[in-house]
């Protein structure tokens, strides 16, 4: 019969014959022959291959370096890589999460719109009219100005995006 020019899924063409790829978690040792199927062996400790493959070496699991603020979020298997994340208060600098930086704080006049996670930084927003933030914080949202009216008080000093209103007693002399 004619030698194949293309092979089925999970096969590869070598020496004019179709050989099975190695399954995830295994590496290629020898191509198939006329006598035997493809020879594959399991990846070792701290190694993985995550696809059907013809790789002769497994990949090393990612190392979550604590010196870079990293920790293991999910331990790798023979078929999956280790997933790193950052220590509390830090977030990844890239999608690959190879190092971490401290979460940014929102300055006075800005509040936290979205709290940072291990993989995303703090998102800040300017405090709109009627709201303020007087601290630099990675957690605090903009707070609404105090409602002097509900306390039977009046505004003595107007609020800003950085300060609350100052309430004072009603002027009793006023009719």
């Amino acid at each position: 019969p004619e030698p194949p020019t293309a092979c089925r899924e999970k096969q590869y063409l070598i020496n004019s014959q179709c050989c099975s790829l190695c399954q995830p978690g295994q590496k290629l040792v020898s191509d198939c022959t006329e006598f035997t199927e493809t020879e594959c062996l399991p990846c070792g400790e701290s190694e993985f291959l995550d696809t059907w493959n013809r790789e002769t070496h497994c990949h090393q699991h990612k190392y979550c370096d604590p010196n870079l603020g990293l920790r293991v979020q999910q331990k790798g298997t023979s078929e999956t890589d280790t997933i790193c994340t950052c220590e509390e208060g830090w977030h990844c600098t890239s999608e690959a999460c190879e190092s971490c930086v401290l979460h940014r704080s929102c300055s006075p006049g800005f509040g936290v719109k979205q709290i940072a996670t291990g993989v995303s930084d703090t998102i800040c927003e300017p405090c709109p009219v009627g709201f303020f933030s007087n601290v630099s914080s990675a957690f605090e949202k903009c707070h609404p100005w105090t409602s002097c009216e509900t306390k039977d008080l009046v505004v003595q000093q107007a609020g800003t995006n950085k300060t609350d209103v100052v309430c004072g007693p009603q002027d009793r002399l006023r009719a």
Partner: antibody
Framework: QLQLQESGPGLVKPSEILSLTCTVS??????????WGWIRQPPGKGLEWIGN???????YYSPSLKSRVTISVDTSKNQFSLKLNSVTAADTAVYYC????????WGQGTLVTVSS | QSALTQPPSASGSPGQSVTISCTGT?????????VSWYQQHPGKAPKLMIY???KRPSGVPDRFSGSKSGNTASLTVSGLQAEDEADYYC??????????FGGGTKLTVL
């Protein structure tokens, strides 16, 4: 058809180095199979795995022989080699080279005697 | 790593079946489906008869079959023939690119 052939001295003195070479013919040492192995068999005894080598040079040795064994590869000559240091009479054996870790192809074996 | 345990000898009459066992641990035989069996006639190199527990290279008679249960692998030769008289060795992958052989079994055809 793939063929493997061991070669080297048949007699080695105690404390010296045993050196053998395996020549692969009928195929390339860096394609079809990517790992190659050495096995030995003392007279009248069973098979013992010595180690394997990846065609780019990574080596894997039997824990019991690791301190004395070196396997190397020469892709330009289509050969891989075994060196065993500080030999004693207990290293007298037929030494085989073979393909992969499955060992579906073997050399015919060569007897190495350790004696003074 | 220790050698896998095989019975030193086994025998059977022509036409009968014989089973040879190969016992290891959960770190080798029990941990991987990478058991091979080799036949060796006197003065000859070993020949691969079974690989990955139960697969036969083409050209090996289907009288030879392999299986595994727990930490023990088995080679069964059915319909024994005179030319089956030989030494049989098992081997297993033992993790981290290590291999281990059994001590061998001498099969006699009575």
């Amino acid at each position: 058809q793939l063929q493997l052939q061991e070669s080297g001295p048949g007699l080695v003195k105690p404390s010296e180095i045993l050196s053998l070479t395996c020549t692969v013919s009928g195929g390339s040492i860096s394609s079809s199979s990517y790992y190659w192995g050495w096995i030995r068999q003392p007279p009248g005894k069973g098979l013992e795995w010595i180690g394997n080598i990846y065609y780019r040079g990574d080596t894997y040795y039997s824990p019991s022989l690791k301190s004395r064994v070196t396997i190397s590869v020469d892709t330009s000559k289509n050969q891989f080699s075994l060196k065993l240091n500080s030999v004693t009479a207990a290293d007298t054996a037929v030494y085989y080279c073979a393909k992969g870790f499955r060992f579906d192809y073997w050399g015919q074996g060569t007897l190495v005697t350790v004696s003074s | 790593q220790s050698a896998l345990t095989q019975p030193p000898s086994a025998s059977g009459s022509p036409g009968q079946s014989v089973t040879i066992s190969c016992t290891g641990t959960s770190s080798d035989v029990g941990g991987y489906n990478y058991v091979s069996w080799y036949q060796q006639h006197p003065g000859k190199a070993p020949k691969l008869m079974i690989y990955e527990v139960s697969k036969r290279p083409s050209g090996v008679p289907d009288r030879f079959s392999g299986s595994k249960s727990g930490n023990t692998a088995s080679l069964t030769v059915s319909g024994l023939q005179a030319e089956d008289e030989a030494d049989y060795y098992c081997s297993s992958y033992a993790g981290s690119n290590n291999l281990v052989f059994g001590g061998g079994t001498k099969l006699t055809v009575l």
